[in-house]
């Protein structure tokens, strides 16, 4: 893996120490020839959780264009999911305009959908 990236199974991961809105985070990953992390299994979930710690962190899952989609094209419906109870809920009550179209790890690792402009930390992933 590149310097400052962490290897696990067939992928390399980079864990941000700053925050960006979801679109900017994905753009950052793309500039590194990577993408926001696609969580494919419970084992991968635990690995990421361990490195991220108890902070909200963007992952590569969005429904900005309609249905929920992983950024690398991995099938969402048949794939691994770890939503918090009653999530995703596309909540409009935050007052920031629109619903919630981007997914993130919460402090306990469960996923939540949130407004994409919140400047959360993020995780990039690329193939080894």
């Amino acid at each position: 893996c590149p310097v400052n990236w962490v290897g696990y199974e067939g992928s390399c991961y980079w864990f941000s120490r700053s925050g960006k809105p979801w679109p900017e985070a994905e753009k950052y990953c793309q500039l590194e020839n990577a993408h926001l992390v696609v969580v494919g299994s419970w084992e991968e979930q635990k690995f990421i959780q361990h490195h991220v710690g108890p902070v909200n962190s963007w992952i590569g899952l969005t429904d900005q264009s309609g249905p929920w989609k992983w950024v690398d094209g991995t099938d969402y419906e048949s794939g691994f999911k770890n939503w918090r109870p009653e999530q995703p809920d596309d909540w409009y009550g935050h007052g920031l305009g629109g619903g919630e179209d981007c997914a993130h790890f919460t402090e306990d690792g469960g996923w939540n959908d949130d407004i994409c402009q919140r400047p959360y930390r993020w995780v990039c992933e690329t193939q080894r």
């Epitope: 809105p21 909200n56 009653e86 935050h94 007052g95 919460t106 402090e107 306990d108 469960g110 400047p119």
Partner: antibody, heavy 121, light 112 residues
Framework: QVQLVESGGGVVQPGRSLRLSCAAS????????MHWVRQAPGKGLEWVAI????????YYADSVKGRFTISRDNSKNTLYLQMSSLRAEDTAVYYC??????????????WGQGALVTVSS | DIVMTQTPLSLSVTPGQPASISCKSS???????????LYWYLQKPGQPPQLLIY???NRFSGVPDRFSGSGSGTDFTLKISRVEAEDVGIYYC?????????FGQGTRVEIK
């Protein structure tokens, strides 16, 4: 230690403009969301505006929307509040406040001492 | 907008005695991320507000352990186990789950 110092307050006539500044020190200013909160004399607290750490997003209370503009200059470690079309009900002490955590926390942990703005003819 | 309602609005307490302030929100403050976005601030006379409690029950750094917060959903309480002279001022609850951030009307605490 975290320091926030507001300046630019004073007496201004209704309909006129005023710009408040908040000089920040003791932390990495460019990593924190910043807010303005105001308090009318003898009244409670009212949140006014927030700006993201990099200035990319700004949100306002309905009472000031279209009249006030929050901005920041990260190279100068300074937060601003440009107030125009001022009304008597804008008379208040204006506090700048810093988000509790870098990038996003959604609440303020550090406050300046405040700048008094009096709108009167 | 979310309305925050505090009771009582004024409280006179004998030093060493407990005090309790209630705060009710017009909507649930539980976010999808599992956190509850409710905070308590104290404004001492002539000073800016200072953070006491974040996310319902977490004491901010340097806050004495006689202050505690509890509650969930829409009902919250700030307790002072033994009031001291330096605790006088106005206590505000605040929500930040929804913009605009909104505060309660404030509860004035004075010493008997």
């Amino acid at each position: 230690q975290v320091q926030l110092v507001e300046s630019g307050g004073g007496v201004v006539q209704p309909g006129r403009s005023l710009r408040l500044s908040c000089a920040a020190s003791g932390f990495t200013f460019s990593s924190y969301g910043m807010h303005w909160v105001r308090q009318a004399p003898g009244k409670g607290l009212e949140w006014v505006a927030i700006i993201w750490y990099d200035g990319s997003y700004k949100y306002y209370a309905d009472s000031v929307k279209g009249r006030f503009t929050i901005s920041r200059d990260n190279s100068k470690n300074t937060l601003y509040l440009q107030m125009s079309s001022l009304r008597a009900e804008d008379t208040a002490v204006y506090y700048c406040a810093r988000d509790a955590h870098d990038f996003w926390s959604g609440y303020f942990a550090y406050w300046g001492q405040g700048a008094l703005v009096t709108v009167s003819s | 907008d979310i309305v925050m309602t505090q009771t009582p609005l004024s409280l006179s307490v004998t030093p060493g005695q407990p005090a309790s302030i209630s705060c009710k929100s017009s909507q649930s403050l539980l976010h999808g991320d599992g956190k509850t976005y409710l905070y308590w601030y104290l404004q001492k006379p002539g000073q800016p507000p200072q953070l006491l409690i974040y996310e319902v029950s977490n004491r901010f750094s340097g806050v004495p352990d006689r202050f505690s917060g509890s509650g969930s959903g829409t009902d919250f309480t700030l307790k002072i186990s033994r009031v001291e002279a330096e605790d006088v001022g106005i206590y505000y609850c605040m929500q930040s789950i929804q913009i605009p951030w909104t505060f309660g009307q404030g509860t004035r605490v004075e010493i008997k």
